[in-house]
């Protein structure tokens, strides 16, 4: 499956929108920094078959979409930017879903992939727990926004590597 060129453009647009969503000075939030344990090894792309990589990417985007679709998220961010961001993510999910269906027919996805998807889910559970503990404060959301920008950048890089493999 070849992800359309519009997919990588959508990726970039999502990152730009996320960057624009910042509301408060980041400098005031240093004390709220937190180690969410991003599962970097799941995004290095070396040990993956393409079907695995695509399903891990899908999980990453799905969880990001879920995180920014909550009521708490709606209260934290400027509505029009949030809607545009969610729309970009939704389009990426559609692209990836089409690929997942196509690729899984081509190669069996080993159980190892379930571990990778679980690692991504646990990562987002840690983010959600952090937000809850911090009572969804503006700084907590700033820290999460920075973290998601970083993890989406990893996703973008993995997608670039997948395209180079084609």
């Amino acid at each position: 499956c070849d992800l359309p060129q519009t997919h990588s453009l959508g990726n970039r647009r999502a990152l730009i929108l996320l960057a624009q969503m910042g509301r408060i000075s980041h400098f005031s939030c240093l004390k709220d920094r937190h180690d969410f344990g991003f599962p970097e090894e799941e995004f290095d792309g070396h040990q993956f078959q393409k079907a695995q990589a695509i399903s891990v990417l899908h999980e990453m985007i799905q969880q990001t979409f879920n995180l920014f679709s909550t009521e708490d998220s709606s209260a934290a961010w400027e509505q029009s930017l949030l809607e545009k961001f969610s729309t970009e993510l939704y389009q990426q999910l559609n692209d990836l879903e089409a690929c997942v269906i196509q690729e899984v027919g081509v190669e069996e996805t080993p159980l190892m992939n379930e571990d990778s998807i679980l690692a991504v889910r646990k990562y987002f559970q840690r983010i959600t727990l952090y937000l809850t503990e911090k009572k969804y404060s503006p700084c907590a959301w700033e820290v999460v926004r920075a973290e998601i920008m970083r993890s989406l950048s990893f996703s973008t890089n993995l997608q670039k590597r997948l395209r180079r493999k084609d």
Epitope: E142, A146, S153
Partner: antibody, heavy 121, light 107 residues
Amino acid sequence: EVQLVQSGAEVKKPGESLKISCKGSGYSFTSYWIGWVRQMPGKGLEWMGIIDPSDSDTAYSPSFQGQVTISADKSISTAYLQWSSLKASDTAMYYCARHPGLNWAPDFDYWGQGTLVTVSS
Amino acid sequence: DIQMTQSPSSLSASVGDRVTITCRASQSINRFLNWYQQKPGKAPKLLIYAASSLQSGVPSRFSGSGSGTDFTLTISSLQPEDFATYYCQQAIDLPFTFGQGTKVEIK
């Protein structure tokens, strides 16, 4: 390879202006903040201020507020430190270093080689 | 501003010695503390971040510990290349502040 390359040594007279630079390469420049640190001859490290190149938001140490200006041009991945009127006491080595911002990653993990500024009449 | 106080300001030691440098913050900084090494004429080099995390490429003889206000940098077995000045730095709030430095000299 991540690199921060600073502009060369400067010799200036008191009252003159100066702008030194720090060019980042090998990483996404807007994903990291750039901090500036002063080291006067034979002395320790003093944190001056920081900039987020993504939106040019800046913060200064009270000791340096109003004395220097920090700026950045993200189109050329470069941060700047400038003085409008130098004093002899500004004679020092100035370092830039990158900071991961609100991300959990090593602070100030890469440093420039330093720019020696000498102010003398 | 948060004040950082290092001790000792200098020490003499021999190759193979275990060396300990302490850093005290004027208020709690949780684990937001970094340690740097600086050699004459060179830029500082990050050794330890978040109080105890070893920076990539730094030898395992360096270790950091502590939280709150009291922190320690330990060199388990001093090597010739370790003779330098060491600085702690708080990273919890702006302005970031450094300790005054500890110079490790050859005995």
